[in-house]
């Protein structure tokens, strides 16, 4: 299979020039992520955008100082969110401009699923919920 | 540039239904978010809430039970429906659009005086 | 419930400098907005992202963040700086928005 095939977007479209990964992580509430996107060609910025699931439309990341941190070499972009909550839950998605030609690249996105219930008690409410 | 006119009856009796409607000109109202916010006499600024054009929406957990908003792509215009209205939901309404991308509004209407009385 | 705080006034003399704050516990993640309005007009956007600023604003209004604090900060106030301004924002999942109270700045 083409490399591009692994980045997939649910529709079925292949992500134009910028390929995000993981598509998914789970970690404890507390724990550093890293997510990463893999850029055809250096000629733009990559910014980060975000949302929750019950949002339509995704706004721009404000990096959290001390906590979230954003790098970017020749082809690699790489958000990094330190002492992860549960409001850091959601998708997070790169998207870069292209400097010569103004066109937006974005990438599928990453999901975010910050765990942490502590409880039995917890526990039992999300099963509840789920059913 | 894009313009924002909201419309609908300027009183409105006491339990009975606020119908308000913004219509966009000069631009699309596609792939923004499109918002309601009121401003009663003296007081400060109050989000009612937003719908995307595919017909999402997220209300002000203050005002959900009695808020509903609508949109109709076509002819550029979304609306506002406040139900079992009373005395202090007597305000400025704004419609607004939402900055792309961002969660501040760059494009207001100009305002219009709804008065709840019987 | 999140909120956002302003000072309900702020005096200054004219070609002083004006500072406005709002402070919210979601202003670290999500980013604030500062409006004028004027009385009988819709407000006006004049600060975006924190601290960036609308075209056709004057370079007089800038805008500053630091932890759950942001700053409006009018240089060489003018009496036509005179008015409402309001921060807004978002809740943490920035899906709710918020507005702060309103300041009224005064021009001596």
């Known amino acids: 299979a083409r490399s591009e095939d692994r980045y997939r977007n649910p529709k079925g479209s292949a992500c134009s020039r910028i390929w995000q990964s993981p598509r998914f992580i789970a970690r404890k509430r507390g724990f550093t992520v890293k997510m990463h996107c893999y850029m055809n060609s250096a000629s733009g910025n990559v910014s980060w955008l975000w949302k929750q699931e019950m949002d339509e439309n995704p706004q721009q990341l404000k990096l959290e100082k001390g906590r979230m941190e954003e790098s970017q070499n020749e082809s690699l972009a790489t958000l990094t969110i330190q002492g992860i909550r549960f409001e850091d839950n959601g998708i997070y998605f790169c998207q870069q401009k292209c400097n010569n030609t103004s066109e937006v690249y974005q990438g599928c996105g990453t999901e975010l699923r910050v765990m942490g219930f502590s409880t039995l008690a917890q526990l039992k409410q999300r099963n509840t919920l789920k059913d | 540039q894009v313009q924002l006119q909201e419309s609908g009856p300027g009183l409105v009796k006491p339990s009975e239904t606020l119908s308000l409607t913004c219509t966009v000109s000069?631009?699309?109202?596609?792939?923004?978010?499109w918002n309601w916010i009121r401003q009663p006499a003296g007081k400060g600024l109050e989000w009612i809430g937003r719908?995307?054009?595919?017909?999402?929406?997220h209300y002000n957990p203050s005002l959900k039970s009695r808020v509903t908003m609508s949109i109709d792509t076509s002819k550029n215009q979304f609306s506002l429906k406040l139900s079992s209205v009373t005395a202090a939901d007597t305000a400025v309404y704004y419609c607004a659009r939402e900055i792309r991308e961002l969660r501040g509004f760059d494009y207001w209407g100009q305002g219009t005086l709804v008065t709840v009385s019987s | 419930s999140y909120e956002l705080t302003q000072p309900p006034s702020v005096s200054v003399s004219p070609g002083q400098t004006a500072r406005i704050t709002c402070s919210g516990d979601a202003l670290p993640r999500q980013y604030a907005y500062w409006y004028q309005q004027k009385p009988g007009q819709a407000p006006v956007l004049v600060i975006y992202k924190d601290s960036e600023r609308p075209s056709g604003i004057p370079e007089r209004f800038s805008g500053s963040s630091s932890g759950t604090t942001v700053t409006l900060t009018i240089s060489g106030v003018q009496a036509e700086d005179e008015a409402d301004y309001y921060c807004?924002?978002?809740?943490?999942?920035?899906?709710?928005?918020?507005f702060g109270g309103g300041t009224k700045l005064t021009v001596l």
């Open positions: 000069s631009g699309s109202i596609s792939s923004y978010y």
């Open positions: 719908i995307y054009t595919s017909g999402t929406t």
């Open positions: 807004q924002s978002a809740d943490r999942t920035g899906i709710y928005v918020l």
